[in-house]
Interface confidence: low
C-alpha cells in the first residue's frame, strides 16, 4: 500500500481519455482502458464510468518528455507510464509515454497490462514484491484475454476499499512459493548452463555458479509458449531446447522459437496412445522420455525410437520407483523429480545416491 494510505472517498469513479496514441485506434484504446479498469472493479466495490467531457477523477493522457508534472518521460523504452495516487487535480491521473509502441498483443508494450498496473497506483496501491503480482514493478507480458487479477493484488485493493459487492468473492492466481514443502515441478531443463524449473505459468531460473534463483513468467521470455508445460530437455549437440505439452512440442534456440513449431510428438515415433510426456532428458546422443512408469529411448542421430522400448523406469534406473514429474542432467547425474522430492541418479555407478526435497534447488534449506 502507498505510504499514508491515500484512497478515494467515493467508490463510483469517473475517468476521461484526454487523447489517443497513433499506434492504436480510438476503439482499441477505449477497450484496453475499459478492460484495465474492469480488472479492479471485479475485485472491489469500485465502479468506473467513462465521461467524454468535464472533470473526471482519473484523466488518462498520452504525453511525451517534459509534460508539466515534474516527471518527464524519456523517449522509447525506459519509463513507460506513471500515475498519481488518489487526490484532487492531478491525483489519480495516468500518463502514458506517447513515444512508446503501444500494442494489443505480446509485442512491447501491451496497453491493457500497463494501464491496469498504472490504475492500481491511481487507486492507492504501490509496488508489490510478489513477482506474480500486477503491481510488481517489472513489465511482463501476460495473455490479456484470459487475464485474472492475481491474489496479491486482490488482497491489496480489498485492504483499501473492502470486498467486492459481488456475491461470489473473486480469487486470483497465487504465485508459487519456492519454499512450499509440497511444491512439485511441471518440467525442468538446462539451457546453456542454467537450470529452469517450470510451474504453471512461471519458471524459476537457477544460475549454476552463482546459485542465484529468480522467478519469471514463462510469457516474459517466450510469449508464444503455453502455460503448464509438461516436459523439457536440452539437446546439447544441436544447442536446442525442446518443450512439451500434450502432444505438441516446441524447439527453442536460446530464446527464439524455431520455425515450423509446434509439432506433433508423432515425429519422435510415439503412437497415438501417448497423449502426454511426463519428463525428458537427453544424454550421450539419446533422449529419454518418461511416461507413466515407463521410459522410452530415442536415438538423436537416427531420429527414431530404439528397439526394445519402452522399458519400466526401475529396470533402467534402479531406485527410481515412482512416476517422474521432471528430470534434467547435471555432471554424471540424472536429477529425477517426483512430487516434492528429487532423486540423484548417478549413471556411472548406476544407482540413486541422494534423495532430498525438490526445492533445495530453489535455495530452500
Amino acid at each position: 500500500l502507498t505510504p499514508g494510505s491515500p484512497k478515494w472517498t467515493h467508490t463510483n469513479l469517473t475517468y476521461r481519455i484526454i487523447n489517443h496514441t497513433p499506434q492504436l485506434s480510438r476503439a482499441e484504446v477505449k477497450t484496453a482502458i475499459e478492460k484495465a479498469f474492469h480488472v479492479w472493479s471485479v475485485a472491489s466495490p469500485l465502479t468506473f464510468t467513462e465521461i467524454l467531457q468535464g472533470e473526471a477523477d482519473i484523466n488518462i493522457a498520452f504525453v511525451s518528455r517534459d509534460h508539466g508534472d515534474n516527471s518527464p518521460f524519456d523517449g522509447p523504452n525506459g519509463i513507460l507510464a506513471h500515475a498519481f495516487q488518489p487526490g484532487q487535480g492531478i491525483g489519480g491521473d495516468a500518463h502514458f509515454d506517447s513515444e512508446e509502441t503501444w500494442t494489443q498483443d505480446s509485442k512491447n508494450y501491451n496497453l491493457f497490462l500497463v494501464a491496469a498496473h498504472e490504475f492500481g497506483h491511481s487507486l492507492g496501491l504501490s509496488h508489490s514484491t510478489d513477482p506474480g503480482a500486477l503491481m510488481y514493478p517489472n513489465y511482463a507480458y501476460r495473455e490479456p484475454s484470459t487475464y485474472s487479477l492475481p491474489q496479491d493484488d486482490i488482497n491489496g485493493i480489498q485492504t483499501i476499499y473492502g470486498p467486492s459487492d459481488n456475491p461470489i468473492q473473486p480469487t486470483g492466481p497465487s504465485t508459487p512459493k519456492a519454499c512450499d514443502p509440497h511444491l512439485r515441478f511441471d518440467a525442468t531443463t538446462t539451457l546453456r548452463g542454467e537450470i529452469y524449473f517450470f510451474k504453471d505459468k512461471y519458471f524459476w531460473r537457477r544460475h549454476p555458479q552463482l546459485r542465484t534463483v529468480d522467478l519469471n513468467f514463462i510469457s516474459l521470455f517466450w510469449p508464444f509458449l503455453p502455460n503448464g508445460l509438461q516436459a523439457a530437455y536440452e539437446d546439447f549437440d544441436r544447442d536446442l531446447v525442446f518443450l512439451f505439452k500434450g502432444r505438441q512440442y516446441w524447439a527453442l534456440s536460446g530464446y527464439d522459437l524455431q520455425q515450423g513449431y509446434p509439432r506433433d510428438i508423432s515425429n519422435y515415433g510415439f503412437p497415438r496412445s501417448v497423449q502426454a510426456i511426463d519428463a525428458a532428458v537427453s544424454y550421450n546422443g539419446k533422449t529419454y522420455f518418461f511416461i507413466n512408469n515407463q521410459c522410452w529411448r530415442y536415438d538423436n542421430q537416427r531420429r527414431s525410437m530404439d528397439p526394445g522400448y519402452p522399458k519400466s523406469i526401475p529396470s533402467m534406473f534402479p531406485g527410481v520407483n515412482c512416476r517422474v514429474d521432471a528430470v534434467f542432467l547435471q555432471d554424471s547425474f540424472f536429477l529425477f523429480f517426483s512430487g516434492p522430492q528429487y532423486f540423484a541418479f548417478n549413471f556411472v555407478s548406476h544407482r540413486v545416491t541422494r534423495v532430498a526435497r525438490s526445492n533445495l534447488w530453489l535455495n530452500c534449506s
Epitope: N77, L80, H82, N108, V114, P137, Q209, Y255
Partner: nanobody, 121 residues
C-alpha cells in the same frame, strides 16, 4: 553475484572517440537488457544508454544522443558503447549493468567495477 567487466576507458581529447566493452566471463548476457551508466565526481550515477536483449531496442540519455551508440554482439557475449565527439562533461567512471524496463523506468543490478573515461585537452 554476476560480475560484469568493463574495458576501453582512457584519456582522450575533446572531440575524440572511445569504444567501451562490457563482458561477463562465465555468464551468458544474451537475454539480458544491458545498459551503460556513468558517474562524474560528486554527482549521481546516471543512465547513458540501454539496449534490449535482442539488440532491437535502444535508449539514450538526451545528453549523448547522436554522439554515442550502444550495440551488442551476443555471439561474443559483449555489449559495446561507441563514444564519438567526446566532451569534457562526459568525464566519469562508466559502468555497465543489467537494466530492466519497468513501468516506472529502468532498474539496475549486476554492476561492474567501472572504467574511467577522462576527456581533457
Amino acid at each position: 553475484q554476476v560480475q560484469l567487466q568493463e574495458s576501453g576507458g582512457g584519456l582522450v581529447q575533446p572531440g575524440g572517440s572511445l569504444r567501451l566493452s562490457c563482458t561477463a566471463p562465465g555468464f551468458t548476457l544474451d537475454y539480458y537488457n544491458i545498459g551503460w551508466f556513468r558517474q562524474a565526481p560528486g554527482k549521481e550515477r546516471e543512465r547513458v544508454s540501454c539496449i534490449s536483449s535482442s539488440g532491437g531496442s535502444t535508449n539514450y540519455a538526451d545528453s549523448v544522443k547522436g554522439r554515442f551508440t550502444i550495440s551488442r554482439d551476443n555471439a561474443k557475449n559483449t555489449v559495446y558503447l561507441q563514444m564519438n565527439s567526446l566532451k569534457p562533461e562526459d568525464t566519469g567512471v562508466y559502468y555497465c549493468a543489467h537494466c530492466m524496463a519497468t513501468t516506472e523506468g529502468y532498474e539496475y543490478d549486476y554492476w561492474g567495477q567501472g572504467t574511467q573515461v577522462t576527456v581533457s585537452s
